[in-house]
C-alpha cells in the first residue's frame, strides 16, 4: 500500500490489528444524487437492452437498500420494438463497498465487504464459437 | 432507520456523535471478483455502445483506484461496424460508497463519501416501446 505520512492531529488507535480497524464518520459527505436509480435515470426504459430494477434490502448492511438490474430480454430491442436474438442483453456488473454489521446487530461496529451488483444492461454481439 | 437490538458483545463507543462515528474492520470479507473490470468482462469491447475504462487514482480515498467508463461514440455501433446516429451511447452511472481520509493523510480515520461513477455504457433510442 501507499505510505501515508502520520498527521499529528489524527485520532489515536489502540486496536492491536491497526490499521485494519479504523474510525469512520458515517455522516456522508456528498448527497448530490438520488440513491434510487429509477429517479436518477430512465435509461432502463429507453435502452435497446432494457432492464428492471429490483430492491435488495438487508438491515445488517449499510447501505441497507441496493437496487439490482435484471435485463428484460435475452436479446436486444430493435427500432420496430421487436427483440433481436442475434444480439444479447447482458448485465453490467460492478464491485461496490458496503459495510456489514459485525458482530451482527451491533450498531457501531462494521466490517468492509465487497459485493457484486448489476447496475444496468448493455447490448453485446454474442461470441461465436467456431467448431472445427 | 431500523432499530438494531444491542448485542452485549458489541464494542463500546465513547464518541459524542455516536452512532455517526463507527469502527470498521478493513479486512475485506469477500474478494471473489476482480477489481479490474477489464479482466472481469469484455463487454466494454463487444457492446453496441462500447466504452473505454479510465483509471482514477486517489491515495486519500479507499479504494484508491476506481475505473471510470467513457463511451467511445456518440451513436451506437451497428453489425457492420459503422456508427448509427439514430441512437446514442450513454454512460450508466451509479452512486458508490468510498472512504475518504479525514483529516487528510490520517491512516486510521475516514469519512464515508458517496461518489457517482460511470460503470459502462448502454444504447438508448428516442422511441420507447413499452413491452408488456
Amino acid at each position: 500500500g501507499i505510505a501515508i505520512p502520520r498527521n499529528s492531529g489524527c485520532p489515536n488507535s489502540e486496536d492491536k490489528n491497526f490499521p485494519r480497524t479504523v474510525m469512520v464518520n458515517l455522516n456522508i459527505h456528498n448527497r448530490n444524487t438520488s440513491t434510487n436509480p429509477k429517479r436518477s435515470s430512465d435509461y432502463y426504459n429507453r435502452s435497446t437492452s432494457p432492464w428492471n430494477l429490483h430492491r435488495n434490502e438487508d438491515p445488517e448492511r449499510y447501505p441497507s437498500v441496493i437496487w439490482e438490474a435484471k435485463c428484460r430480454h435475452l436479446g436486444c430491442v430493435k427500432a420496430d420494438g421487436n427483440v433481436d436474438y442475434h444480439m444479447n442483453s447482458v448485465p453490467i456488473q460492478q464491485e461496490i463497498l458496503v459495510l456489514r454489521r459485525e458482530p451482527r446487530h451491533c450498531p457501531n461496529s462494521f466490517r468492509l465487504e465487497k459485493i457484486l451488483v448489476s447496475v444496468g444492461c448493455t447490448c453485446v454481439t454474442p461470441i461465436v464459437h467456431h467448431v472445427a | 432507520g431500523i432499530a438494531i437490538p444491542r448485542n452485549s458483545g458489541c464494542p463500546n463507543s465513547e464518541d459524542k456523535n455516536f452512532p455517526r462515528t463507527v469502527m470498521v474492520n478493513l479486512n475485506i470479507h469477500n474478494r471473489n471478483t476482480s477489481t479490474n473490470p477489464k479482466r472481469s468482462s469484455d463487454y466494454y469491447n463487444r457492446s453496441t455502445s462500447p466504452w473505454n475504462l479510465h483509471r482514477n487514482e486517489d491515495p486519500e480515498r479507499y479504494p484508491s483506484v476506481i475505473w471510470e467508463a467513457k463511451c467511445r461514440h456518440l451513436g451506437c455501433v451497428k453489425a457492420d461496424g459503422n456508427v448509427d446516429y439514430h441512437m446514442n451511447s450513454v454512460p450508466i452511472q451509479q452512486e458508490i460508497l468510498v472512504l475518504r481520509r479525514e483529516p487528510r493523510h490520517c491512516p486510521n480515520s475516514f469519512r464515508l463519501e458517496k461518489i457517482l461513477v460511470s460503470v459502462g455504457c448502454t444504447c438508448v433510442t428516442p422511441i420507447v416501446h413499452h413491452v408488456a
Partner: antibody, heavy 118, light 110 residues
Amino acid sequence: EVQLLESGGGLVQPGGSLRLSCAASGFTFSSYAMSWVRQAPGKGLEWVSAISGSGGSTYYADSVKGRFTISRDNSKNTLYLQMNSLRAEDTAVYYCARDLIWGVAGSWGQGTLVTVSS
Amino acid sequence: NFMLTQPHSVSESPGKTVTISCTRSSGSLANYYVQWYQQRPGSSPTIVIFANNQRPSGVPDRFSGSIDSSSNSASLTISGLKTEDEADYYCQSYDPHSVVFGGGTKLTVL
C-alpha cells in the same frame, strides 16, 4: 409532465455577459441531453449548443464557439448557458429543450429574451 | 455544415391535405432522424413529428412524416386541415457535430 422554465434574459451591452438558466421538472433530468436553441426577432430557429446527460460532452454552433459555455447541475435539475462577448446578432429569444437523443429535441421551454444593444 | 431547404410558404383550404418538403443539401438524410416543429405566433415551438415518422402523444394522426432517400428529402403531411394548423413549420436534422433547422414554412389555412 415535462416542464422547462428559462430565466436570466435581459438587456446587455455589446461585449457584455449574461447567464441563462433553465429549470427542469417532470422527468429524470440526468438521463437526457439538453440543448439551447435561439430565434432572432422575425427569423427562424437556430441551434446554439447541447450537452450530454452526464455533462461530459458539450457541443456548440460555430457562431457561438469560444464565447458561450453550456453546463448543467444534475443535483439541481438545471441547465445553464454562460454567454460572454455578446454581439448585436446574439439578440434573440433563447429556448432550452430536452433531447430524446442527440439532435432530437422533444420538449421546449417558453423562452427568455436576450437583447444586446448599446 | 449541411443545409435544410423548405418552401417559404404554402397555403390550402380547410379539410384539404398539404405537404411540406425538406431537402438536405449534403450527407444522407436516412442516416439521421428528421423532426418537425410547429410554431404558432407568439408561442414556443412544439414537436409534431420526431424520428422521421413518430407522433408524440397529443398530436393528432392528421400529422404524418416520411422520408425519401432517393431525393434526400423529408415531408410533413397534414390532412383534414384545420384553421388551428396555421403556423410556421420547421424541419430539423443533425450530424455528429451539429444540429440544423430548415428556414421554416409558413402554412396559411385559407
